[in-house]
């Protein structure tokens, strides 16, 4: 029995009502009693508070009864006040006392999973024991009394991959799982109250467990061997084909990079199309069918992102071999030189050999070519070519003094495919032959004064030659054997010029108005050529003043070396 806190004389036992009790009502709950109660009916007990009269009542002996069945989950206790009074005087015998009637729990609630549906994600290949998620069930029964709300969790579906901790509901992995084998699991968890004993209620929850991807797969080529072709006319940078690898991972983990592992020729490259995840084989250097028409390269593929801890899955990159066949493009014949320089002496007879051009069909060693000369409309045909062997000959003698160089264009045409033509320039130099004699470089007007003294210079002369003026080209001047040699002398200056001097004095216009000097000019060609050029010397009537010497004849006024009107 219990006494009130105030220790005033109230006596009661703990008061409980088992919920959902279905025995006949009213049902006895317990006894409230004052120790002053003589049990003679002189005292009256009064209940106030929660549920007084409506749910609970007390009789004259202090016995408390419940009128109806209770539900702990709606209300788990009731707080009431008890009074005891003298029935006659209505005076309290004891002070009021507060007491509690507890509703005792029965297992009338099933566990419930309130947070579903459950979805959890865990990285694939996570180690055994990795926590995936936690599920928690609730039970409306009293957790503080008995086992009605004490739950145990167990796995209904999901073995052997998952386990659940019985008390906490933590789901763990029991083995390493591969997303690429299966990426989603449905796990069914049961929560059972009464710690699993008989009469327990249970509930189940489905947990969808998704495996997230880790980079545990390397990319692998779809084919171990590829065959591509490229035209020899393809420019550098041309895409000649694609190669493809697959990766069982997804997203970033499947991003890959292609590269060349082996290409001795360094002719090709591989770039990655990150949108399609294909490798594009690119021509890095131009190919030439005639030089090499079969290539073999090895390509490799690797993932773009590989964390250090996953490198064990990526030890050896997948490779593939690519055979590349070069396709022939029929090319025009190729001359041995882009341009030819030939030479021939001027004046040689027609039909003389100038030189030979040569071209060949690189596409076919056995195929012949035909040669021809492109004829300009305005050009005289000075040369011809042998169409079979490319020898060029003259069609008439050439004159260097008319043209020292000739530029002709020759063509080579494939006999098996006349559309294929190539051209080359031929520059022909006409070599000089000493076929022109020297002559005065201009017409000289030469004067001598009547009062000239011996040894006086009256004229400087020079010569020209239509032949090629080489550095060591020389002209030699002398007086031809003639009657006037006593009046004048020629002095060769050794520099391709000469001076004409008076040899005597006493020139008289009356006696001889002109002298005609035959001057011999010799070159140093091979063989040397000579010519006689006549210098006309006019005798003048001169003033005595040195700087104003005049030569009067008829209506003309002459000055030595100059003429004025």
């Amino acid at each position: 029995d219990y006494k009130d806190d105030d220790d005033k004389g109230w006596v009661w036992e703990p008061l409980f009502v088992t919920e959902e009790e279905t025995s006949t009502m009213p049902m006895y709950v317990g006894q409230l009693k004052s120790d002053l109660d003589k049990e003679d009916g002189s005292l009256q007990y009064i209940l106030t508070g929660e549920g007084a009269d409506s749910i609970f009542f007390i009789n004259e002996h202090g016995k408390i009864y419940v009128r109806q069945k209770l539900d702990r989950e709606k209300k788990s206790f009731y707080i009431l006040r008890a009074q005891v009074i003298n029935r006659k005087t209505r005076h309290p015998i004891e002070p009021d006392s507060e007491f509690i009637i507890k509703v005792r729990d029965i297992n009338d609630h099933e566990p419930q999973f309130l947070d579903g549906p459950y979805v959890a994600t865990v990285p694939e290949m996570s180690p055994e024991g990795t926590s995936v998620t936690q599920v928690t069930a609730t039970d409306g029964d009293d957790p503080s009394y008995g086992n009605n709300a004490r739950l145990l969790y167990s796995l209904i579906q999901g073995q052997p991959y998952f386990s659940v901790e019985p008390k906490t509901g933590v789901i763990r992995m029991t083995s390493q799982m591969d997303r690429e084998t299966k990426d989603q699991y449905l796990v069914v968890i049961q929560a059972k109250d009464m710690v699993g004993q008989a009469g327990a209620f249970s509930a189940t929850a489905t947990v969808t467990i998704n495996l997230s991807d880790v980079n545990d797969n390397k990319p692998i080529f779809k084919e171990s061997l590829y065959r591509l072709t490229v035209s020899e006319s393809a420019p550098t940078g041309t895409s000649i084909g694609t190669i493809m690898a697959y990766d069982n991972d997804i997203g970033e983990n499947a991003e890959m990079d292609y590269s060349i592992e082996e290409d001795d020729s360094q002719t090709f490259d591989i770039i990655t199309n990150h949108e399609t995840q294909e490798g594009i084989v690119i021509l890095k250097k131009k190919v030439d069918f005639e030089h090499q028409n079969h290539y073999g390269i090895r390509a490799k593929v690797k993932n773009h992102h590989v964390p250090e801890q996953l490198m064990k899955y990526h030890t050896e990159a997948s490779t593939t071999f690519i055979k590349i066949q070069v396709e022939d493009v029929d090319e025009p014949p190729v001359f041995t030189l882009e341009s030819y320089v030939m030479e021939i002496a001027e004046g040689v007879v027609s039909g003389s050999l100038v030189g030979t051009v040569s071209a060949r069909d690189l596409d076919n060693d056995d195929s012949s070519v035909r040669y021809s000369i492109v004829q300009g409309l305005h050009l005289k045909r000075l040369f011809s070519i042998n169409e079979h062997n490319g020898t060029i000959i003259t069609t008439e003698p050439l004159d260097r003094e008319k043209a020292s160089w000739h530029n002709i264009t020759v063509t080579a045409t494939e006999t098996r495919n006349p559309e294929k033509i190539s051209e080359a320039n031929v520059y022909i130099q006409v070599l000089d032959v000493n076929d022109h004699a020297p002559e005065f470089s201009k017409y000289y007007e030469t004067f001598v004064c009547e009062n000239a003294v011996p040894g006086q210079l009256i004229q400087n002369i020079s010569a020209v030659d239509k032949d090629d003026s080489a550095e060591n080209h020389r002209f030699y001047f002398s007086l031809a054997q003639a009657t006037n040699s006593s009046h004048f002398t020629v002095k060769d200056n050794q520099d391709n010029t000469a001076g004409i001097f008076t040899a005597g004095s006493g020139f008289s216009r009356k006696e001889q108005f002109y002298f005609f000097l035959p001057i011999l000019i010799l070159d140093n060609g091979s063989p040397p050529l000579t010519s006689t050029n006549t210098l006309t010397v006019t005798v003048c009537d001169c003033d005595t003043e040195v700087n104003t010497l005049y030569c009067r004849y008829g209506a003309f006024l002459y000055s030595i070396g100059l003429s004025t009107e």
Epitope: S224, L225, T229, H291, H294, G296, F321
Partner: antibody, heavy 120, light 107 residues
Framework: QVQLQESGPGLVKPSQTLSLTCTVS??????????WSWIRQHPGKGLEWIGY???????YYNPSLKSRVTISVDTSKNQFSLKLSSVTAADTAVYYC????????????WGQGTLVTVSS | EIVLTQSPGTLSLSPGERATLSCRAS???????LAWYQQKPGQAPRLLIY???SRATGIPDRFSGSGSGTDFTLTISRLEPEDFTVYYC????????FGPGTKVDIK
């Protein structure tokens, strides 16, 4: 293991056309990346490549024989064939069919060869 | 076309000796484009080496290849009785051509 077997007449008259067939077993002629060749060997002499074909029908021939050679393929029969026209005694040889390699254009698999004699 | 020259034409050696066979190209070829074959009388050629030092499947390791540019070598480290036969080199870069062969016979 890929195996190749040549078949065809052992005697051909001059100016006629030599025809040989190669049957492939142990693998498909349509395998990606492989080329199927004909090679010949004159008696007591070295080897001369004649030409090859890819299963798509694309062929390439030795330039010196190009004008006389035709190689064709029949994927349904897993066979490829050689035709050499206007034959002379100089075409007398052992004719081999071959398949190239998985890492290059070398000849990895060969038939045992068939002797073709050109004679009237 | 690329012409391959093999030397010597005939190589006379004894079993157990080392054989060195030479193959020379008329112009540079990439080392990846050369192969060696063995041919026994009445048989088809058999691939030994490609590229130029990779052994074909089932080829004993006494066979090895080397070289680059225009000069290539096949070496048989210790001649076995079955190795005395004819050997051909082949280039497969510019069309396909074979060397004339080297005969290895017993001294």
């Amino acid at each position: 293991q890929v195996q190749l077997q040549e078949s065809g007449p052992g005697l051909v008259k001059p100016s006629q056309t030599l025809s040989l067939t190669c049957t492939v077993s142990g693998g498909s002629i349509s395998s990606s990346g492989y080329y199927w060749s004909w090679i010949r060997q004159h008696p007591g002499k070295g080897l001369e490549w004649i030409g090859y074909i890819y299963y798509t029908g694309s062929a390439y021939y030795n330039p010196s024989l190009k004008s006389r050679v035709t190689i064709s393929v029949d994927t349904s029969k897993n066979q490829f064939s050689l035709k050499l026209s206007s034959v002379t005694a100089a075409d007398t040889a052992v004719y081999y069919c071959a398949r190239d390699g998985s890492s290059g254009w070398y000849f990895q698999y060969w038939g045992q060869g068939t002797l073709v004699t050109v004679s009237s | 076309e690329i012409v391959l020259t093999q030397s010597p034409g005939t190589l006379s050696l004894s079993p157990g000796e080392r054989a060195t066979l030479s193959c020379r190209a008329s112009r540079n070829i990439s080392s990846s484009y050369l192969a060696w074959y063995q041919q026994k009388p009445g048989q088809a050629p058999r691939l030994l080496i490609y590229g130029p030092s990779s052994r074909a499947t089932g080829i004993p390791d006494r066979f090895s290849g080397s070289g680059s540019g225009t000069d290539f070598t096949l070496t048989i480290s210790r001649l076995e009785p079955e190795d005395f036969t004819v050997y051909y080199c082949q280039q497969y870069g510019s069309s396909f051509t074979f060397g004339p062969g080297t005969k290895v016979d017993i001294k």
